[in-house]
Amino acid sequence: ATKLTEEKYELKEGQTLDVKCDYTLEKFASSQKAWQIIRDGEMPKTLACTERPSKNSHPVQVGRIILEDYHDHGLLRVRMVNLQVEDSGLYQCVIYQPPKEPHMLFDRIRLVVTKGFSGTPGSNENSTQNVYKIPPTTTKALCPLYTSPRTVTQAPPKSTADVSTPDSEINLTNVTDIIRVPVFN
C-alpha cells in the first residue's frame, strides 16, 4: 500500500489556510474536485466541491471554504478562512473520476489550529479580513448534502454563511456510482 504523507500547517484562530493541490494531469482539468476531512479510521467526508464540470478560475464558496480550480496550472486552490480550533484535523483534495474511485492528490494536509493571541483580530498578514470580497454569486453548496434513492427536502444551513443548494444537485440518479467514498488501505 502507498505510504500516505502529510504536510503540517500550524495556524492561529482567525487565520486562513491556503493550500494548492497540484493535479498536473491535463485530463483532470474539468473533472469535479472536492475537499474532504478524514475522520478517525480513514473515513473521508466531503465538505465542499467544485462544479461539475469544474470551471476554470471560478471561485466556489461553501461556508468558510473557498475552492478555485486553475486548469492552466493544474492546481486546485483551497482556502479555509477564519479558522477555528475545531477545524483542526486531517484533510485531502480528491478528483472525482467516475466510475473509478476518486483520485487523491498528495499530500494530505494536517491542520492544527490554536487559540490566537489577544491582539487585534486580523492584525497580521495571514488574517482573513479581505476574503469575503469574493462576489456572493460564487456562494454555492455544490456537493449534494445527502445522496439517497429517496427524495429529500433541502434547506440552506442556518449559519452566517449563506449556502444554498441548487435544485439540480438534489435528486441525482445513480449518484452513489458517481461519488463513491475513497478508500485508502
Epitope: Q84, E86, T147, S148, I179
Partner: antibody, heavy 120, light 112 residues
C-alpha cells in the same frame, strides 16, 4: 428499496462472544459507511463504531476498543459486528445503520435490531 | 468526546398543540462548510430509530412539515408545530461533527 436486515436474537453467557450480521440491499454497498449503535433495555442510544465497507477500515468508540471487531463481506453486501468478553451490561439491542454519503453524516437507514442477552 | 444534553426528559403533550425539545452540545457542531452536524431521530415504541432532521434543519424524506429543526453552534431545537398521536416516542439528537458520534439522552413525548 434500501434495506438493512439483521441476524436473529442471541443469548450468550458472560465471557463469550457474539457476532451480529447486517445484510444490505437496494443500494451500492461499498458507497456508504456503516455504523453500529446499541441500546440497553430502557436506555438511550450508544454509538459503537463505523466501518468503511469499501476498504474495510474501522473506527471504534473508546469504550469498546479491544472488544469489538467490525468486518464486511462485499460479495454478500454484509457487515458484521463481533463483541467479545461479554458481560451482563452488554445486554442490548444492536442496530446497524447506514451513513448517508457526501456532505451530510446522518444515519438514514437502520436495521431492525438484534437483541443480545448476556446471562449466566 | 462531544457531550449532548437534551431537555426535557419527558414531554406530555396535547394533540394539536406545539412541542419543543432542546439539545445542547459541549462543542460547536458548525463545520467549516457552514453546516451544523446535528441530527434528530425519533424512536417509536418497539421500532428502530428513524431520521427526522439532518444537518440541523433539513427534513429527511417523508418527514411531515410539522417537524422543524433550528439552531447553530451548540444550541439546537426540534419543534413540532401540531403534535399528532403518531408522534409519540423518544426523540434523540445526535452529533455527527466528529467521531465518536454521540447521542443526547432522549426526550420521551407522550400524549397527556
Amino acid at each position: 428499496q434500501v434495506q438493512l436486515v439483521q441476524s436473529g436474537a442471541e443469548v450468550k453467557k458472560p465471557g463469550a462472544s457474539v457476532k451480529v450480521s447486517c445484510k444490505a440491499s437496494g443500494y451500492t454497498f461499498t458507497s456508504y459507511y456503516m455504523h453500529w449503535v446499541r441500546q440497553a433495555p430502557g436506555q438511550g442510544l450508544e454509538w459503537m463504531g463505523i466501518i468503511n465497507p469499501s476498504g474495510g477500515s474501522t473506527s471504534y468508540a473508546q469504550k469498546f476498543q479491544g472488544r469489538v471487531t467490525m468486518t464486511r463481506d462485499t460479495s454478500t453486501s454484509t457487515v458484521y459486528m463481533e463483541l467479545s468478553s461479554l458481560r451482563s451490561e452488554d445486554t442490548a439491542v444492536y442496530y446497524c445503520a447506514r451513513e448517508v454519503s457526501m456532505t451530510a453524516a446522518s444515519l438514514d437507514v437502520w436495521g431492525q435490531g438484534t437483541m443480545v442477552t448476556v446471562s449466566s | 468526546d462531544i457531550v449532548m444534553t437534551q431537555s426535557p426528559l419527558s414531554l406530555p403533550v396535547t394533540p394539536g398543540e406545539p412541542a419543543s425539545i432542546s439539545c445542547r452540545s459541549s462543542q460547536s457542531l458548525l463545520h467549516s462548510n457552514g453546516y451544523n452536524y446535528l441530527d434528530w431521530y425519533l424512536q417509536k415504541p418497539g421500532q428502530s430509530p428513524q431520521l427526522l432532521i439532518y444537518l440541523g434543519s433539513n427534513r429527511a424524506s417523508g418527514v411531515p412539515d410539522r417537524f422543524s429543526g433550528s439552531g447553530s453552534g451548540t444550541d439546537f431545537t426540534l419543534k413540532i408545530s401540531r403534535v399528532e398521536a403518531e408522534d409519540v416516542g423518544v426523540y434523540y439528537c445526535m452529533q455527527a461533527r466528529q467521531t465518536p458520534f454521540t447521542f443526547g439522552g432522549g426526550t420521551k413525548v407522550e400524549i397527556k
